[in-house]
Structures are given as structure tokens and as C-alpha cells.
């Protein structure tokens, strides 16, 4: 008799754990910026504080009739999904509601900003336990709304936002496009993307993960014990806000970066049918459905990494793409991807004290993506070693020469634009372990890290016959930190990481051109963290 | 994630109005004006004036007051609806779009964003 969505996101071992703390005495507080809500509903009564905050535009139309239960519908349902007694994800959590959406579900960027400022002021006046802010709303891309989310996130608040219901790229909407926000798309009971009329869930690189968002049973504002089902990315975001609240009630010191990494790591992978998304968005959209992670005590000090895609560079000759990790994360490797295969590679550089991953378009190219591998490495000390391009016919070698530093990623950047001149760069694990090798006209960048117990190794997989892609996975217990494509076809599209899988993509036309001796190789750098061990390179 | 995607950014570095104030005449607008790419979602007439990160509390108020004063000299009444201190320095203002060029030339202004709708999802 448990609703499908709760069964999906809360594994069996957590169901019983929850029963031991009925009304929870958690200090986590969730702030909901939405419509007004019905505080007397049995699902949320006693858990919800309806603040006096109200910043909404007038309803449209002269004949609009304000009916309380309709005005409260969206917010009441979401409050119930987060902390409802019977259908809530985090049943013990206290919730504060701020009214930023009117009876028609419309608000303004300015009203939302004032709401976020109200939360910041409350935090300053009366510091409390961990705060989660749920933003089940979306408007067009707004630089200031994203900036406000960034500022609030940097004070330790965790923001969770709806990806949007426009069947579009979430990066075109705010707050969904703010990197500091956990952005949630919606899936149904079959783990497929939610369709809503002619539209549906948003997608793309700005979505962090998906969660149940179709036919979700929750509190109905029609009466104090009524329930109804609602659908949308708001419901999906409410599930993740509930999961985050539960994670923080167990471990109040978890940071935003840790929460996001754990949500990604423990989500259900590869169940979404990516064909629902536009072809150009499929590689950028995470195939992840949220589940409640176990506590860090149960899972030990795993090395956690995620892939961050840049925006598309655009097609101009010198266009660059930049991918950034969160401030707490380490950029362990940088790769690039171009649908046309015309790219001049990738490199890591420091901008304003932060390492960023950059990729460069080539003449005649349609644009590139930079792909950063962002990891949580406690007490890490990472640096970049680079060697300029060697003379024609010579190889360039870069390795980690500092003591106890291990290679976590390689990047290659070609000075020449003539794609026919250059050969693909390579990692060489055979002769000298832990070394990046570049071929003609390639500058080589090695990402080298020292951290207690960090050990890494290279794993390669090659295919000689025709193939659109070559993959290699890190085995259980190891985490993919670097991913490159090694010499093979004269034209590769690039390489990127999908969870623990390194994907090297080959241009369609290049498949026919290849001689049998030219294998395309996907090379993965796999690392693990064993706190008791010394940093080492595994051959 | 935060690249300015489908977004309108207009440079309004308009010539200074004949106002006789040295600091205004000397200040060429480097600030930009931004608005939602979806026209139906725009709220013209309400603007969020975002100031540089390090702007002090008193300077925020002075900038808002300066805008009101200069607008009044041109025969416009503007209303400061809210001043942002805690998350970012700035203020929310109701005014004619005719005054955007003037507002962009104020000291401390980083950019101005036209207000727009957000929707329940």
C-alpha cells in the first residue's frame, strides 16, 4: 500500500529505519517558495510554519475568482510530498512556506529574489540547523536569479529546483540553470521521462538527476484529509528536497558538493530511455533516477566523481567552451567532444584561483563541449603539468614527477588546425606508468594529485573494426577520473565519462577509412581512495 | 551551467543627458541591460538594478536615491520597491524604460534586469 514513488526512491532498508523516528526531531528546515498552502491538512499540520511572506503579482483577468483551495493546491501538494505524515519523503521535517506564486501559479523573478533574501535574513537573525530551499518554479534564464541562488548556496543553504515542464533544455530556464542548485527532472512509474500534454520534463546538462514526477499522490488542499495526484518537475524536485532533508537529518554536516555527489552516485542508473530526448541532448542528459543514499558511515570513504559538461562553444573558429567544478570539488581531468570531430583539444587552466576545463573549436567545426570530471578528494593537492608541442615526428611525454602524486587525467591541445597533419594523442601505460604522451603538434597536460591513499591505474579497450564508439569501464571499487581516446581513426569526436564508463566516440565517416591495424582505444584512468594506503600508481 | 543562453543582453551606452553633473557626464555606461528571451514572460516597467559585488549598504541607498533625483529632473517619477542588501547589492524599481540609459550610467551598476514571470512547475 506504499505509493509507487516512495517505493522507488526509498530502498527497502530505509523504510524500516524511518519507522523508528515517527515525527523525527530533525533540525533540518525546508523552505518552500510556492503558492499559499493549507496548513491544517493532516499531512503537514504541526510540521509547517506559514510565514507572513507574500510577494506575488496580481492574478490575470477581471473575472478571476480566488478560491482558497485552488490557491493552495500546488504548495500544499509539494509540502506533503516533502514532509507529509503518510505520503511524504521526509516525514519528520519541518517546513516553512513563503508565498511567491499567486492563485494562478504565477510569480515574478523579483518576488522570488525577495523570498530568497527573506530566507537569508532569517538565517542571519536566527541561525539554525541545515536549510534546504525548494524552488518548484521556473522562468526564463535570469542572471540575477541564478546569482542569488549562488550567493545563498555559498552560505551553506542547499537549493533544489524544478528543471521545468517545457520539454526543453533546462539551461534556458532559471533557477534550473544555476550550477549551485540541484536541478531535478521528472520520470514516471516506468522510469521514463514525464510527458505533460504536448510538453514534458526539461532535460540537458543543467539537470543533475531525475526523480518521480508523474501521478504523485500527495496532500490535496480540497480538505484536511484529502489526497490527489499531481505531476511535474515540481513534484520531482520535492522528492529530492525530501531526500536531502533526510540525508542532512542523519548527517547535518554534509555539504552541497557532498550531497550532490552522493545523490548522483547512489541514483539508479541507465533506466531512462534516452530516445525521448532530442538527439543532441541525449549525451548531455544524466540517466539517473534519485534514490535515498545510505549514510557515509555505511559506505566508507569512496572516491566520488561526476561529469560536468560545458555549454556549447558555438561554431566560430576560436570558440572555446569552459566547464567548471563546484568550489569544493577537484577537477581531476578534462576532455572534449565535438559532433563534427573538428576540435583542437582540451586543457586545464586556472581562472581566478580555480582550475577550469577548456576546449577549443577547430576551423570548420560546429562547436565543442568541454567535459570536466569533478571529484570529491579529501585533503587533495592537485596540480597541472604541461609540455608544449614537440617538433614534427616526436612524441611529447608528461608524467607526475612530484613524490606521491598520481596521474588522474590527461588533456591534449593541438596548435595546428589541419586535422590531417596530426595524430591522436595517447596515454602510455605500458612503458612508463602514469604518463601522458602526445603526438605531433600536441601540447600535453597531465593532472597530478596527491591525497591520502589515492591510487590510480590506466585501463584501455580498443576496437579495430567499424564502431561508432569504444567504451571502457572501471571495475567495482574504482572510480573513473580520466577518459581519453587514443590513436585510431584520423577523426574522433572526443571522449567523455558517463558514470564509471569512459566513452570514446568516432566519426561515422572515419569508420570506413580505417585500416584494420588502426584500433580506436578508449583509455580510462581509474582511481580509488584507500585512506590507510599511500598514494600510488597501479600497473 | 550558468552561461548566458537564450537571453537578451542589450548594451545601452547612451550619451549622457544634459544634466550638468560632472560624475554622470564622466561615467560611460559599461553596465548591460538584460531581459527574458520570451516576450510574453517580460514585465516591462519593473527592473532589478544589480550593483557591483562589493557595493556598501550606504552606496546602494545612494545609488537608488541618485536615480530618483535624476529621473525627477527629467520629469519622471520612479518608485523604489525594494532594496536588496543581504544576498546581493541592488534594488527593485518601477520606472519608465526611457530611463534605462540613465540608470545604466550610474556608478556601481553592474547590470539591470527587467523583471519577468516565473511559473509553478
Amino acid at each position: 500500500s506504499i505509493p509507487w514513488n516512495l517505493e522507488r526512491i526509498i530502498p527497502a532498508w530505509h523504510q524500516t529505519e524511518e519507522d523508528r523516528s515517527p515525527d523525527g526531531s530533525s533540525q533540518v528546515e525546508v523552505y518552500l517558495l510556492d503558492t499559499s498552502i493549507q496548513g491544517a491538512h493532516r499531512e503537514i499540520e504541526g510540521r509547517v510554519t506559514i510565514t507572513d511572506f507574500n510577494s506575488v503579482p496580481e492574478e490575470d483577468g477581471t473575472r478571476f475568482h480566488r478560491q482558497a483551495s485552488k490557491c493552495d493546491s500546488h504548495g500544499t501538494h509539494l509540502a506533503g510530498v516533502v514532509s507529509g505524515r503518510d505520503a511524504g519523503v521526509a516525514k519528520g521535517t519541518s517546513l516553512h512556506s513563503l508565498r511567491v506564486l499567486n492563485c494562478q501559479g504565477k510569480g515574478t523573478v523579483s518576488g522570488t529574489l525577495i523570498g530568497l533574501e527573506f530566507i537569508r535574513k532569517s538565517q542571519l537573525i536566527q541561525p539554525s540547523g541545515p536549510l534546504v530551499v525548494l524552488l518548484p518554479l521556473a522562468g526564463g534564464y535570469s542572471r540575477i536569479l541564478n546569482a542569488a541562488c549562488r550567493h545563498l548556496a555559498r552560505t551553506g543553504v542547499v537549493l533544489v529546483a524544478a528543471a521545468g515542464n517545457f520539454r526543453d533544455d533546462a539551461c534556458l530556464y532559471s533557477p534550473a540553470s544555476a550550477p549551485e542548485v540541484i536541478t531535478v527532472g521528472a520520470t514516471n512509474a516506468q522510469d521514463q521521462p514525464v510527458t505533460l500534454g504536448t510538453l514534458g520534463t526539461n532535460f540537458g546538462r543543467c539537470v543533475d538527476l531525475f526523480a518521480p514526477g508523474k501521478d504523485i499522490i500527495g496532500a490535496s488542499s480540497d480538505c484536511s484529509t484529502c489526497f490527489m495526484s499531481q505531476s511535474g518537475t515540481s513534484q520531482a524536485a520535492a522528492h529530492v528536497a525530501g531526500i536531502v532533508a533526510r540525508m542532512l537529518s542523519r548527517e547535518p554536516t554534509l555539504t552541497l558538493a557532498e550531497l550532490r555527489q552522493r545523490l548522483i552516485h547512489f541514483s539508479t542508473k541507465d533506466v531512462i530511455n534516452m530516445a525521448w530526448f532530442p538527439e543532441d541532448q541525449q549525451v548531455l542528459t544524466p540517466n539517473l533516477v534519485a534514490t535515498l543514499p545510505p549514510s557515509t558511515h555505511e559506505t566508507g570513504g569512496q572516491l566520488l566523481c561526476r561529469t560536468v559538461w560545458s555549454a556549447h562553444s558555438g561554431p566560430t573558429r576560436t570558440a572555446t567552451a569552459t566547464a567548471r567544478c563546484a568550489p569544493e570539488e577537484e577537477l581531476l581531468s578534462c576532455s572534449s567532444f565535438s559532433r563534427s570531430g573538428r576540435r583542437r583539444g582540451d586543457w586545464i587552466e586556472a581562472i581566478g584561483g580555480q582550475q577550469v576545463c577548456k576546449a577549443l573549436n577547430a576551423f570548420g567545426g560546429e562547436g565543442v563541449y568541454a567535459v570536466a570530471r569533478c571529484c570529491l578528494v579529501p585533503r587533495a593537492n592537485c596540480s597541472i603539468h604541461n609540455t608544449p608541442a614537440a617538433r614534427a615526428g616526436l612524441e611529447t611525454h608528461v608524467h607526475c614527477h612530484q613524490k606521491d602524486h598520481v596521474l588522474t587525467g590527461c588533456s591534449f591541445h593541438w596548435e595546428v588546425e589541419d586535422l590531417s597533419v596530426r595524430r591522436q594523442p595517447a596515454l602510455r601505460s605500458r612503458r612508463q606508468p602514469g604518463q601522458c604522451v602526445g603526438h605531433q603538434a600536441a601540447s600535453v597536460y597531465a593532472s597530478c594529485c596527491h591525497a591520502p591513499g589515492l591510487e590510480c591505474k590506466i585501463k584501455e579497450h580498443g576496437i579495430s573494426g567499424p564502431s561508432e564508439q569504444v567504451t571502457v569501464a572501471c571495475e567495482a571499487g574504482w572510480t573513473l577520473t580520466g577518459c581519453n581516446v587514443l590513436p585510431g581513426a584520423s577523426l574522433t569526436l572526443g571522449a567523455y565519462s558517463v558514470d564509471n564508463l569512459c566513452v570514446a566516440r568516432v566519426h561515422d565517416t572515419a569508420r570506413a577509412d580505417r585500416t584494420s591495424g588502426e584500433a580506436t582505444v578508449a583509455a580510462a584512468i581509474c582511481c580509488r581512495s584507500r585512506p590507510s594506503a599511500k598514494a600510488s600508481w597501479v600497473q | 551551467q550558468d552561461e548566458d543562453g537564450d537571453y537578451e543582453e542589450l548594451m545601452l551606452a547612451l550619451p549622457s543627458q544634459e544634466d550638468g553633473l560632472a560624475d554622470e557626464a564622466a561615467h560611460v555606461a559599461t553596465a548591460t541591460f538584460r531581459r527574458c528571451s520570451k516576450e510574453a514572460w517580460r514585465l516591462p516597467g519593473t527592473y532589478i538594478v544589480v550593483l557591483m559585488e562589493e557595493t556598501q549598504r550606504l552606496q546602494i541607498e545612494q545609488t537608488a536615491h541618485r536615480l530618483q533625483t535624476r529621473a525627477a529632473r527629467r520629469g519622471y517619477v520612479i518608485k523604489v520597491l525594494h532594496i536588496f542588501y543581504d544576498l546581493f547589492p541592488g534594488f527593485l524599481v518601477k520606472m519608465s524604460s526611457d530611463l534605462l540609459g540613465l540608470a545604466l550610467k550610474l556608478p556601481h551598476v553592474e547590470y539591470i534586469e527587467e523583471d519577468s514571470f516565473v511559473f509553478a512547475q
Partner: antibody, heavy 126, light 106 residues
């Protein structure tokens, strides 16, 4: 079929705490589909809902009585209990326990009080 | 708090007659209203829920109607066992009961 039976002292002194237990038979109190409620009826008067509880011990009280009421559940004994503190003569009533569908699972039946126990009279007097 | 007012307080009728009981709410309760029957020394029994749905085992002579603030319980032809007190109850906002209507034999 499901039956509910109230038990507890019939006489309580003013300012003391009234304690009653409802024993459920013919069904499990541990079902997530139901709430378990207390309702009272002063002699010759109407009915008043006191509060409800679910199998997890999550409670929902009448705002006018909230400060004095505690409802608890013991799933191992298939019982739930009522404590009403600082009683006065105005608390003299027949106290009923009843089942109520939570509403989360519509198939569980109507979201109202059904069935009820037969009631127990509690008199507050010194 | 939503106040439910029942009328009349007492209804004196003979077996076979039609009984019409009224319940008025101080504000809209939509269709979230139920009717209960209580006989002396017994617990109340659910008759009608959500304004017009008969509970399991309730004879067809009992029917409910109304929505918003005005509701009616109708007993088309009174049987001897129908003489009792009838209460309405709402769940739009918390739970409150009406004061009751006593249906007695004339």
C-alpha cells in the same frame, strides 16, 4: 470483521490525567492505510473529535485540545491510547475510538470514521 | 473552525413517512460531509460519506445530497429502526460535527 474496544477507569478526579486504551481486533493497527481516532460525546450533547494517530505514531490533534492531549500507539499489542491532562467536569463524556482511512490509498475505503468502538463513559468528579 | 448547524433539532414522524434532515456549514465544505446514525447506548454508524455516497450495508432508503454549505439527508420511508439521532460531520477543515437531529416517533 474489525472491532474496537475502549477500556480504562470510569472515574477520574479533577486536575488529574484521564487515560484510556483502545484494543483493535480482527485487523492490524500496523496498516499504513489507516488512522486511529478518539472522539467524545458529553452526556446529551454532540460529538467532538479529539485526535488521531497512525501506525508510525504520527499524531493529529484538535487545536482546541492540543495542549492537553497525547495519543500513542503500540503496534505489538494492537492498541492505541489517549491521555488527557488537567481534566475538569467539562471533560465528562462517553469516549469512543474509531478507525479512519488515511486517504493515501483510495481503495482502503471512505475517508471517514468507521467502524467505532461501543464507547466508555468517563466521569470527572472528586 | 467550521460550524455545522443541523435542523430541525427534533423531527417527529410516523413510520413510512419521508424524513428530510438539514445540515448547514458556516463556510463551504465542498462535498466533504458525512452523516452518522446513533441509537441510544450505541456508537455512531456511518451512513453517507462525501455528501451522497452510501456506506457499505446501508439501505437504499437513505440518500444524501448537497454541496458547499447546504446538505440534506433524506430517508424516503421511515422504518421503525430508523428512529435515532443523526449527526453530520465535515472534513474540509479539521473535523467537526453538527449538534444532531433527533428523529422520533410521532
Amino acid at each position: 470483521q474489525l472491532q474496537l474496544q475502549e477500556s480504562g477507569p470510569g472515574l477520574v478526579k479533577p486536575s488529574e490525567t484521564l487515560s484510556l486504551t483502545c484494543t483493535v481486533s480482527g485487523g492490524s493497527i500496523g496498516s499504513s492505510s489507516y488512522y486511529w481516532a478518539w472522539i467524545r460525546q458529553p452526556p446529551g450533547k454532540g460529538l467532538e473529535w479529539i485526535g488521531s494517530i497512525n501506525y508510525r505514531g504520527s499524531t493529529y490533534y484538535n487545536p482546541s485540545l492540543k495542549s492537553r492531549v497525547t495519543i500513542s500507539v503500540d503496534t505489538s499489542k494492537n492498541q492505541f491510547s489517549l491521555k488527557l491532562s488537567s481534566v475538569t467536569a467539562a471533560d465528562t463524556a462517553v469516549y469512543y475510538c474509531a478507525r479512519e482511512n488515511s486517504g493515501v490509498v483510495p481503495a482502503a475505503g471512505p475517508n471517514w470514521f468507521d467502524p467505532w468502538g461501543q464507547g466508555t463513559l468517563v466521569t470527572v468528579s472528586s | 473552525e467550521i460550524v455545522l448547524t443541523q435542523s430541525p433539532a427534533t423531527l417527529s414522524l410516523s413510520p413510512g413517512e419521508r424524513a428530510t434532515l438539514s445540515c448547514r456549514a458556516s463556510q463551504s465544505v465542498s462535498s466533504y460531509l458525512a452523516w452518522y446514525q446513533q441509537k441510544p447506548g450505541q456508537a455512531p454508524r456511518l451512513l453517507i460519506y462525501d455528501a451522497s455516497n452510501r456506506a457499505t450495508g446501508i439501505p437504499a432508503r437513505f440518500s444524501g445530497s448537497g454541496s458547499g454549505t447546504d446538505f440534506t439527508l433524506t430517508i424516503s420511508s421511515l422504518e421503525p429502526e430508523d428512529f435515532a439521532v443523526y449527526y453530520c460531520q465535515q472534513r474540509r477543515n479539521w473535523f467537526t460535527f453538527g449538534g444532531g437531529t433527533k428523529v422520533e416517533i410521532k
